[in-house]
């Protein structure tokens, strides 16, 4: 996240960290217990993903730290990478074990979506991650967030060569410096509704990162919170 | 105690001291010797019963006020004059999280998993010791809402 | 292409220890866990735990925790298991196997897909 | 700790049969893997989640279920498909296997 501010521990308790073979590369949040949703971008075929939930600063080790190997990753099924790498980019991550819910660890909302679609037209998300703090600079050890003003459709695709999506949104400063970047994809958008928030975004891509006359890119969670309830039934 | 003989006792009264000349507020509060009933009373006779017009639409109920007047709908209506059909494309039916019509047509106020309505019918409040969406450590000091 | 390979069968008196090796090849070895399975003579298998040799994170069944310690040597490409205490009762094939994302309709799903042609121990005073 | 039972135990089957082994499970598993193991060798992997079949495997063998109850096909029973049949969950831990269905041919 660049242009944002250190989270205070617990703040963001939906949010995890996925971490590699070496080293963290996306983000994500709890559905429930046994899955996390996030980018399906973050999905590399072959490689080992660990879920660490209940992080704060990756450069130390935390009690409130619950690692979790994924033992099954769904992208949804209209993902197809070689045709576009960031379409439909969403995926869900089912859990080796469940996590213990605690003030560390919390999932979050997730409501219709039609519901999903009036709070993401609230206006105003928080976003999160561990990502990049600068363009192209240093990867941030202490959660960063941001709040972000929703961008209409309209300017939105003035702003880019590129496609984007009805299963898409944007949203930004136009004036730049403050964004979403590389490292936070397939960490929350969130918006805050009378003190409980519901996930209306996934973190997705963008062109560089807070660039002026640029906006983040999100996944709109509207258009597939019937394929996540259906699939993270906890039986 | 003969409450018929009690309020020919408060109406002859009245007729004496707030009628037949002006009265003030405290005048009038010795004869009702009632704060509630003299507010009520005091109401109309200083300017006049807004509710006399019957403002209050499909069934609502008038209350009288100083010049103004306050209507009590009805479940099923909103707005000043309860002339709305109360719906939850209005500011959501008055929900916290999620509003649908029942049956009956009323707005009913519902909850995302792991929150249960609150008394009011209208609120949510958390049914689990950690319900999704919530900020739950005491010592966060940032408030998300800027 | 992949392969497990598993060190010789081992005689050991109760109350010993043994190390038991599985080197592979034909992969990234840092980049998958290796699951210890044994099966005793005529049962079925019985899963012991798993190691991720990229950051030595391990997994063991509670039932076994104790008895087996996973480990790893990353420069050679080897998995240990060394079990302690050993009674009758450990007398067994044991086998390491690789775990790996299997790629179907799009997702991923993990699965135990190449194992080591076993190591018997047969534990006798 | 999600017990498999797998039934039956034995079977006996004729060569161009079609045969079904089963696996139940004692809690709801999110998909199941089955592996065949032939007299004196290792564990090979067979279907890898519920109902796909590992890399090799002859397309007589199929598998469906959901749940708690999961079954193996397979279609045309062949000579060489006389082994011990595992199925394996990976929903919880400890991770756990079946008892096994030995299928022999007559």
């Known amino acids: 996240v660049v242009g944002g501010e250190d989270a205070e521990r617990g703040q963001f308790p939906w949010q995890v960290l996925l971490h590699g073979e070496i080293a963290a590369f996306c983000g994500g949040s709890i559905v429930n217990e046994k899955w996390v949703v996030t980018a399906a971008h973050c999905i590399k075929p072959g490689v080992k993903i660990t879920v660490v939930a209940g992080e704060h600063n990756t450069e130390k080790p935390e009690p409130t730290e619950q690692k979790r190997n994924v033992i099954r990753a769904i992208p949804y099924h209209s993902y197809n990478a070689s045709i576009n790498k960031y379409s439909h980019d969403i995926a869900l991550l089912e859990l080796d074990e469940p996590l213990e819910l605690n003030s560390y660890v919390t999932p979050i909302c997730i409501a219709d979506r039609d519901y999903t679609n009036i709070f993401l037209k609230f206006g105003y998300g928080y976003v999160s991650g561990w990502g990049k703090v600068f363009n192209r600079g240093r990867s941030a050890s202490i959660l960063q967030y941001l709040k972000v003003p929703l961008v209409d459709r309209a300017t939105c695709l003035r702003s880019t060569k590129f496609s984007i999506y009805s299963h898409m949104f944007c949203a930004g400063y136009h004036e730049g410096g403050k964004d979403s970047c590389q490292g936070d994809s397939g960490g929350p958008h969130v918006t805050e509704v009378e003190g409980t928030s519901f996930l209306t975004g996934i973190i997705s891509w963008g062109e560089e990162c807070a660039m002026k006359g640029k906006y983040g890119i999100y996944t709109k969670v509207s258009r597939y919170v019937n394929w996540i309830k259906e699939k993270t039934k906890l039986t | 105690y003969n409450s018929g003989k009690l309020e020919e006792f408060v109406r002859g009264n009245l007729e004496r001291e707030c009628k037949e000349e002006k009265c003030s507020f405290e005048e009038a509060r010795e004869v009702f010797e009632n704060t509630e009933k003299t507010t009520e009373f005091w109401k109309q006779y200083v300017d006049g019963d807004q509710c006399e017009s019957n403002p209050c639409l499909n069934g609502g109920m008038c209350k009288d006020d100083i010049n103004s007047y306050e209507c009590w709908c009805q479940a099923g209506f909103e707005g000043t004059n309860c002339e709305l059909d109360a719906t939850c494309s209005i500011k959501n039916g008055r929900c916290k999280q999620f509003c649908k019509r029942d049956t009956d047509n009323k707005v009913v106020c519902s909850c995302t998993d792991g929150y249960r309505l609150a008394e009011d019918q209208k609120s949510c409040e958390p049914a689990v010791p950690f319900p999704c969406g919530r900020v739950s450590v005491s010592h966060i000091s940032k408030k998300l809402t800027r | 292409q992949v392969q497990m390979q598993q060190s010789g069968a081992e005689l050991v008196k109760p109350g010993a220890s043994v190390k038991l090796s599985c080197k592979a090849s034909?992969?990234?070895?840092?980049?998958?866990?290796i699951n210890w399975v044994r099966q005793r003579p005529e049962q079925g298998l019985e899963w012991i735990g798993w190691?991720?040799?990229?950051?030595?994170?391990?997994k063991y069944n509670e039932k076994l925790k104790g008895k087996a310690t996973l480990t790893t040597d990353k420069s050679s490409s080897t998995a240990f298991m060394q079990l302690s205490r050993l009674t009758s009762e450990d007398s067994a094939v044991y086998f390491c196997?690789?775990?790996?994302?299997?790629?179907?309709?799009?997702?991923?799903?993990?699965?135990?897909?190449?194992w080591g042609q076993g190591t018997s121990v047969t534990v006798s005073s | 700790q999600i017990v498999l039972t797998q039934s039956p135990a034995i079977m006996s089957a004729s060569l161009g049969e079609e045969i079904t082994l089963t696996c139940s499970a004692s809690?709801?598993?999110?998909?199941m893997l089955w592996y065949q193991q032939k007299s004196g060798t290792s564990p090979k992997l067979l279907i890898y989640?519920?109902?796909n079949l590992a890399s090799g495997v002859p397309s007589r063998f199929s598998g469906t279920g959901s749940g708690t109850f999961y079954s193996l096909t397979i279609s045309s029973v062949e000579a060489e498909d006389a082994a011990d049949y595992y199925c394996?969950?990976?929903?919880?831990?400890?991770?756990?296997f079946g008892g096994g269905t030995k299928l022999e041919i007559k």
């Open positions: 196997a690789r775990s790996a994302y299997y790629r179907y309709d799009g997702s991923y799903y993990y699965a135990m897909d190449y």
């Open positions: 034909g992969y990234t070895f840092t980049s998958q866990d």
């Open positions: 190691i991720f040799p990229g950051d030595g994170s391990t």
């Open positions: 809690s709801s598993v999110s998909y």
């Open positions: 989640t519920t109902s």
């Open positions: 394996h969950q990976w929903s919880s831990y400890p991770r756990t």
